[in-house]
């Protein structure tokens, strides 16, 4: 994942005595918040593994990279990062592993330079449709986000509110068409069973899409046609059985694409013939020589590239009168 990194320049820790020493005064504009480490040279603030329950109020105006990982934030309310003056420089925000389960509409408003956002490893039971767009207008102001990292944000089964988790995430991605400039989207490890068909068409700038380690069974209704800039598509560790002709043609038509398909339970029957033919010819699949059959049993562990049409048969469907019970 491409979470923000910082240079190793010296960090000033806010010493425990500082809070009481300045208790009667408002905080200085570029003072380091309690429980954080700050480097003005690196424009970086780290408030990591400190069990913070809210976003610090007195973040220095110079902050470009903000790490709020390993905390207990629970909720990001509207305007969680809104400050006077605004945090105009903040470009990379990492909130991973901070026990967030609720991100409200407008949580990231007033961050005009925010390009990278990492919300991974938070059990997001309640992600507002307007978390990233900030308003419920049909067309919102464009978000500056270029990278959105949402790996492992699926909440436990009992906290999913009897609604489609996929639908909730996609609604947030598409609201107000705010994320038209998004180039990297990571959605790995989210138990996705399907990809809603409209999602990719509305993210035309995508260069990198990571859907690995989900439970995707099929891409039949997913169109990649508009993603002319797509450079990498990660589909490893899903439940894909076969890629059909329409999908193969669309992938082949993308000029810069690299596709990763390892560790899927490929079903090597007559429906696999087109995919095998395509694999033998295409250059877009990385590590294609590692792809093996999972089913039927007689084909298990056979390498897809080594199959020929005679290997790919379907058992005849018997008329009902001949079927055994």
């Amino acid at each position: 994942s491409s979470s923000p990194t910082s240079s190793a320049s010296s960090f000033s820790s806010s010493a425990p005595f500082l809070a009481s020493a300045v208790s009667a005064q408002p905080p200085l504009p570029d003072q380091c918040p309690a429980l954080c480490e700050c480097s003005e040279a690196a424009r970086t603030v780290k408030c990591v593994n400190r069990n913070l329950t809210e976003v610090p109020t007195d973040l220095p105006a110079y902050v470009r990279n903000l790490f709020l990982t390993g905390n207990q934030l629970a909720v990001l309310p509207a305007g969680a990062f809104a400050r006077r003056p605004p945090l105009a420089e903040l470009a990379a925000l990492n909130l991973s592993g901070s026990r967030l389960d609720e991100v409200r509409a407008g949580a990231f408003e007033h961050l005009p330079s925010l390009r990278q956002l990492d919300l991974s490893h938070n059990p997001l039971a309640d992600l507002s449709p307007f978390a990233f767009s900030g308003s419920n207008a049909s067309v919102s102001a464009p978000s500056p986000l270029v990278e959105l990292i949402l790996n492992h944000i699926v909440p436990p089964e009992d906290e999913r509110q009897n609604r489609s988790f996929e639908g909730m995430v996609v609604a947030a991605l598409l609201a107000g068409r705010a994320l038209q400039g998004l180039r990297r989207l990571e959605l790995a490890s989210n138990h996705f069973l399907y990809l809603p068909r409209d999602v990719l068409a509305q993210l035309p700038s995508l260069r990198h899409l990571d859907l690995s380690n989900n439970s995707l069974v099929s891409l039949t209704y997913v169109s990649f046609r508009n993603l002319t800039h797509l450079e990498s598509l990660h589909l490893e560790d899903n439940a894909l059985k076969v890629l059909h002709n329409g999908t193969l043609a669309e992938l082949q038509g993308l000029p810069h694409i690299r596709v990763f398909l390892d560790n899927n339970p490929w079903v090597c029957d007559c429906h696999m013939a087109d995919m095998v033919t395509w694999l033998k010819e295409t250059e877009v699949v990385q590590g294609k020589d590692r792809l093996t059959c999972a089913y039927p049993e007689k084909m298990r562990n056979r390498v897809l590239l080594e199959l020929n049409s005679a290997d790919l048969d379907c058992d005849p469907i018997l008329p009902p009168s001949l079927q055994t019970s």
Partner: antibody, heavy 120, light 111 residues
Framework: EVQLVESGGGVVQPGRSLRLSCAAS????????MHWVRQAPGKGLEWVAY????????YYADAVKGRFTISRDNSKNTLYLQMNSLRAEDTAVYYC?????????????WGQGTTVTVSS | DIVMTQTPLSLSVTPGQPASISCRAS??????????MHWYQQKPGQPPQLLIK???NLESGVPDRFSGSGSGTDFTLKISRVEAEDVGVYYC?????????FGGGTKVEIK
């Protein structure tokens, strides 16, 4: 047993300052966010200020913003409210109250309060 | 700011009878997973005491004749059988956003 004991109240003239303290015991003070809430004579409750467990986050009601400062000293298990430029409308009983680390759960323990009277 | 409106202003109840207090927020204070609404009791000469947190969760040590319900903008505190010790003022409060605001209070008296 959780205990919160406020002190520092008194009678003060308008424009002057006062510092309230709240001594906490019976729980791990550094794990909890703390609030000040006030109640004018015969009136309802008004939230005043909040400070997070590690002092990284603090919020104020508009009525006191720029005049009051909330702080804490976790080594002394003590919460403070520095009140400057006091006005007649600041006259109230001031309570300190605790909230669990997740602020969603309400104010679960309150002190007995300390009375501030602003009068010329 | 979110305005909390409590009704009624006062309530005179016969011991053993039920009582109900309503609180309406000027905007929703619930997410799909959580309600940020709490109820307090303030007996004469004492500080407030938390009765119910997040709409319906009884605080430990609070008698189970108290219950809370509601979501969004409308919330209710119920006392199934009022007892003499229940006299006092009851307040609702939200923690949806800063500033937290309280309702104006409902005074409960015994007939």
């Amino acid at each position: 047993e959780v205990q919160l004991v406020e002190s520092g109240g008194g009678v003060v003239q308008p424009g002057r300052s006062l510092r309230l303290s709240c001594a906490a015991s019976g729980f791990t003070f550094s794990n909890f966010g703390m609030h000040w809430v006030r109640q004018a004579p015969g009136k309802g409750l008004e939230w005043v200020a909040y400070i997070s467990s590690g002092s990284s986050t603090f919020y104020y009601a508009d009525a006191v913003k720029g005049r009051f400062t909330i702080s804490r000293d976790n080594s002394k298990n003590t919460l403070y409210l520095q009140m400057n430029s006091l006005r007649a409308e600041d006259t109230a009983v001031y309570y300190c109250a605790r909230s669990p680390a997740y602020y969603r759960y309400g104010l679960d323990y309150w002190g007995q309060g300390t009375t501030v009277t602003v009068s010329s | 700011d979110i305005v909390m409106t409590q009704t009624p202003l006062s309530l005179s109840v016969t011991p053993g009878q039920p009582a109900s207090i309503s609180c309406r927020a000027s905007q929703s204070v619930s997410s799909s997973t959580f309600s940020y609404m709490h109820w307090y009791q303030q007996k004469p000469g004492q500080p407030p005491q938390l009765l119910i947190k997040s709409s319906s969760n009884l605080e430990s040590g609070v008698p189970d004749r108290f219950s809370g319900s509601g979501s969004g903008t409308d919330f209710t505190l119920k006392i199934s059988r009022v007892e003499a010790e229940d006299v006092g003022v009851y307040y609702c409060q939200h923690s949806w956003e800063i500033p937290y605001t309280f309702g104006g209070g409902t005074k409960v008296e015994i007939k």
